[in-house]
């Protein structure tokens, strides 16, 4: 029997039946084995077919076969029902051999051509299965010449058999308190060959509790307890299972807060898996009641291990634990199921007693002490001295603890000094230099230091004067004596303040004029106010309207008297505002330099002379009725004038204090 | 004015448990914490811990948990102190106090003598 | 827990002299909303203790003005100006800042 070609040869030829393309002799039989490379099949067609019919093929043949399966027994021309011819079939050996045996018997009724075929050998796509067979490879099949190979899918690793793919399903560790776990592509048939471990890990003091859901399918076997494929479950305490078949698990209270699921598949079956719901539960904790006053959120049936609640309070209370106040609170229960944390209580805001208004009381409303949330207080000033700033007085305790005025300050509320109160009456007249009696000039200030100079208390802490009276004193103000509140300058009576800081006008020049001839001290204290001692007014806007030429302005003073010496007693003079011109035009002439008198002064005294303040004045105020508030107000500070006080035809020069209003305001709300 | 009104001295067996009392008057007990403290013979003293009669929640020294439990009665305005597995350790003088916004001490009980003895 | 340590354990004082004790705790006693629950009693012999001063300084309704507090963190001091009989006792003095509330180990005050 003549052997086809044999691998590695090209694997490609041509056969034909002897004597062929002539008629083929009888009792002939001849066979040809065909191989190819592994991983090869080989393809065999006919260009020509011509052999005696027979029933079922008995008398002449060509038979195909591949290792032990006969493909086809080949006669005739064309096919009938009982028999086949190859007509334009391509054949295919099952493997990498083909085997082609023909036959032909004793005799033929009329002469036959044979056959002449053609083979090839070509790669076998072994990805391609054909319907109803097992797939080449679980999940992804590649062919190549020579052959294939298989892999998986992600989550999945190729078994050792090089076919299966097994799941990666170990090591997942679940540890929320709920939660779902299941077979791998469930509820998709799960994976061969695969072995499954899955935790459960919860913190101590929880309780597993494991529920089969859904449907729940492993492969079994009626004798033997899951032989093929399995699910345990185990805890520290004991084991679960194994489980297998149709029939759902009951509930597994596991009284343990670490599982450990596994599951073990073979190679065969084709069965949906299982479905667990886990959920934990823990020793609850004492259902936690709200304070009076407060909330607890959230609100839950039970709490466990882990819950915790939060406590509010309502408007106008506070979260106290005993005398310490909370800025939240948040209780977790714990593993042995108590609260890590004591209820605390909702109090009402307390405010507290009210800070004391200085020169002011305070007066409970709402009763007694009580100076809880929604309590009302009420702050007054002293009356006749002093007078409430910025608001009504009124407090109220809000929620947040503070006092609160009802413009929403938290502040106190400021009790200023009414200014420019004056026991005496001013008739209009004018007379010579008199007495002060007390009460008349209460703004009044002595001031010590080197010579005796005059100011003029302004609010309860600061003192208004000439720059040139404590010039020499501006880095040392401590050297300045200040009294207050006396009518005797040699009294032992009287009240004492002490300068903390002198302002001097940056404009004024010493010894170069008396341009900006103005100063304030500020006092280290603020002097209590009473009749005795209570501060000017500053002008208003509409103050020019009382300091016209003729109006009448008081200077006050222990300056130089006609008898040449300081006055033991405060005295007083009433002198009118004198024209502007004829005041600059009176110091034109030597010996006063040209522009003495500036547009930052104004001059008063009578053309007669006689009346007029002097040495030891300066600083004082030359103060002014104002007719609508019935308020006095400073108009002038005592600057200069002619060497001879009370001079005929000279003037007392004052520096204009209107001028200088935005400076003394602005130095007083800076320091 | 404030008064804490306390039980008077006990003679009890060891392993046994004793129950203080201290009786609230002149505030609203439901507003105020109140305190458990012991004083050992000639030692100084100890908190036990507090309740809040406002919502019966307790609050227990780590020494003393598990053998002290605090208990209100707000009918008699009374707030009661169980002390259990008492050993000689136990005797002392047990105070009750008030407290105020300023701290937990502001108001005290006479106090109770409590004798652990077989 | 927060240890109060007082000294010196024992006072020995004529009357009409001044007395001083001095409180030191093992962490700061200042509170987050700025206070600081230091308070001061006194235990006359026989009697239950009493709160002479709370929140360091501030003195309880009837205790006489020549008691005074002072201190801050974690520093106090109690000052007796003139020593009078009715002072005798032990003092202690007791934070409210931490839990659980710890007392200091006391000041027996003697007259000489």
């Known amino acids: 029997t003549p052997l086809g070609p044999k691998w590695p040869e090209p694997v490609f030829g041509r056969l034909a039946s002897p004597g062929f393309p002539g008629e083929y002799a009888n009792d002939q039989e001849r066979r040809w084995t065909l191989t190819a490379p592994p991983g090869y099949r080989l393809r065999l067609y006919f260009t020509h077919f011509d052999l005696e019919l027979s029933h079922l093929c008995e008398y002449d043949f060509v038979k195909l076969s591949s290792g032990a399966k006969v493909l086809a027994t080949l006669c005739g021309q064309e096919s009938t029902d009982t028999e086949r011819a190859p007509g334009k079939d391509t054949f295919y050996s099952l493997g990498s051999s083909l085997d082609i045996t023909f036959r032909s018997d004793y005799s033929n009724e009329k002469p036959f051509t044979g056959f002449e075929a053609f083979y090839a050998a070509e790669d076998i796509d072994e990805c391609q299965v054909a319907p109803g067979e097992a797939p080449t490879c679980d999940h992804h099949c590649h062919n190549h010449l020579g052959g294939f190979y298989c892999s998986c899918r992600a989550g999945y690793v190729l078994h050792r058999n090089k076919r299966t793919c097994s799941a990666l399903c170990s090591g997942q560790v679940f540890t929320q308190r709920s939660g779902e776990l299941s077979s791998p592509e469930y509820p998709r048939p799960y994976p061969k060959l695969s072995s499954c471990t899955y935790s459960i890990s919860l913190e101590e003091g929880f309780s597993v509790i494991l529920d089969f859901v859904e449907s729940f399918d492993v492969e079994t076997h009626p004798e033997t307890l899951c032989p093929y494929d399995f699910l345990k479950i185990q805890t520290d305490r004991e084991e679960h299972g194994p489980f297998c078949g149709k029939t759902l698990p009951h509930r597994i209270e596991t009284k343990s807060n670490t599982v450990t699921i596994t599951f073990v598949t073979d190679e065969s079956g084709d069965h949906t898996g299982w479905k667990i719901h886990y959920t934990s539960t823990a020793q609850p904790c004492p259902y936690p009641m709200a304070p009076p006053n407060g909330h607890v959120s959230p609100v839950q049936a039970k709490y466990i291990l882990k819950d915790s609640f939060s406590i509010f309070c309502e408007t106008g209370y506070e979260l106290l634990q005993g005398h310490l106040p909370l800025k939240s609170f948040t209780a977790v229960c714990q593993k042995d199921g108590s609260w890590d944390r004591p209820m605390p209580a909702c109090s009402i805001v307390d405010c507290g007693p009210p800070d004391d208004l200085p020169s002011g009381r305070v007066e409970y409303i709402t009763g007694p002490g009580v100076t809880t949330y929604k309590a009302v207080i009420q702050y007054s000033c002293e009356e006749t001295f002093y007078t409430m700033k910025v608001n009504d007085g009124k407090y109220v305790c809000e929620a947040d603890g503070f006092w609160t005025s009802s413009k929403g300050e938290k502040s106190l509320p400021v009790c200023e000094p009414v200014c420019g109160l004056s026991a005496r009456t001013t008739g209009g007249r004018i007379y010579g230099g008199q007495k002060a009696k007390p009460g008349d000039f209460p703004w009044q200030v002595l001031i010590l230091g080197g010579t005796t100079a005059a100011g003029a208390l302004l609010y309860d802490n600061w003192v208004l004067t000439a720059a040139h009276a404590v010039y020499e004193q501006k880095h040392d103000a401590s050297a300045l004596d200040i009294r207050m509140g006396t009518l005797k300058r040699l009294s032992p009576h009287y009240t004492q303040a002490w300068s903390e800081a002198v302002f001097i006008h940056e404009g004024y020049t010493h010894d170069a004029g008396f341009d900006n001839d103005i100063a304030l001290i500020k006092l280290n204290n603020k002097v209590v106010i009473n009749s005795n001692i209570t501060p000017i007014c500053l002008p208003r806007k509409e103050a020019e309207s009382f300091m016209r030429t003729d109006d009448i302005g008081t200077a006050s003073g222990w300056g130089l008297t006609q008898r040449g010496f300081l006055a033991r007693n405060l005295m007083y003079v009433d002198i009118p505002i004198v024209d502007h011109q004829k005041c600059t035009a009176a110091y034109e002439k030597p010996p006063y330099p040209r522009g003495s008198v500036t547009a930052n002064m104004l001059c008063a005294g009578l053309e007669s002379g006689g009346k007029d303040s002097c040495r030891g004045d300066s600083g004082g105020a030359l103060v002014f009725l104002d007719s609508e508030t019935e308020r006095w107000f400073v108009g002038g500070i005592v600057s200069w004038g002619s060497m001879n006080c009370g001079e005929a035809g000279q003037y007392g020069v004052y520096t204009k204090v209107i001028n200088y209003i935005p400076w003394i305001e602005n130095i007083i709300s800076d320091f | 004015q404030v008064q804490l009104q306390q039980s008077g001295p006990d003679l009890v067996k060891p392993g046994t448990s004793v129950k203080i009392s201290c009786t609230a008057s002149?505030?609203?007990?439901?507003?105020?914490?109140i305190n458990w403290v012991k004083q050992r013979p000639g030692q100084g003293l100890e908190w036990i811990g507090w309740?809040?009669?406002?919502?019966?929640?307790?609050y227990y020294n780590e020494n003393f948990k598990g053998r002290a439990m605090f208990t209100v009665d707000y009918s008699s305005s009374s707030a009661y102190m169980l002390l259990s597995s008492l050993t000689s350790e136990d005797s002392a003088v047990y105070f009750c106090t008030r407290g105020d916004r300023s701290g937990p001490f502001a108001y005290w009980g006479q106090g109770t003598l409590v004798t652990v003895s077989a | 827990d927060v240890v109060m340590t007082q000294t010196p354990l024992t006072l020995s004082v004529t009357i009409g002299q001044p007395a001083s004790i001095s409180c030191k705790s093992s962490?700061?006693?200042?509170?987050?909303?700025?206070?600081?629950?230091l308070n001061w009693l006194l235990q006359r012999p026989g009697q239950s203790p009493k709160r002479l001063i709370y929140l360091v300084s501030k003195l309880d309704s009837g205790v006489p003005d020549r008691f005074t507090g002072s201190g801050s963190g974690a520093d106090f001091t109690l000052k007796i100006s003139r020593v009078e009989a009715e002072d005798l006792g032990v003092y202690y003095c007791v934070q409210g800042t931490h839990f659980p509330f710890t007392f200091g180990t006391g000041t027996k005050l003697e007259i000489k």
């Open positions: 002149g505030y609203t007990f439901t507003d105020y914490y």
């Open positions: 962490q700061s006693l200042l509170y987050s909303n700025g206070k600081t629950y």
């Open positions: 309740i809040f009669p406002g919502s019966g929640s307790p």
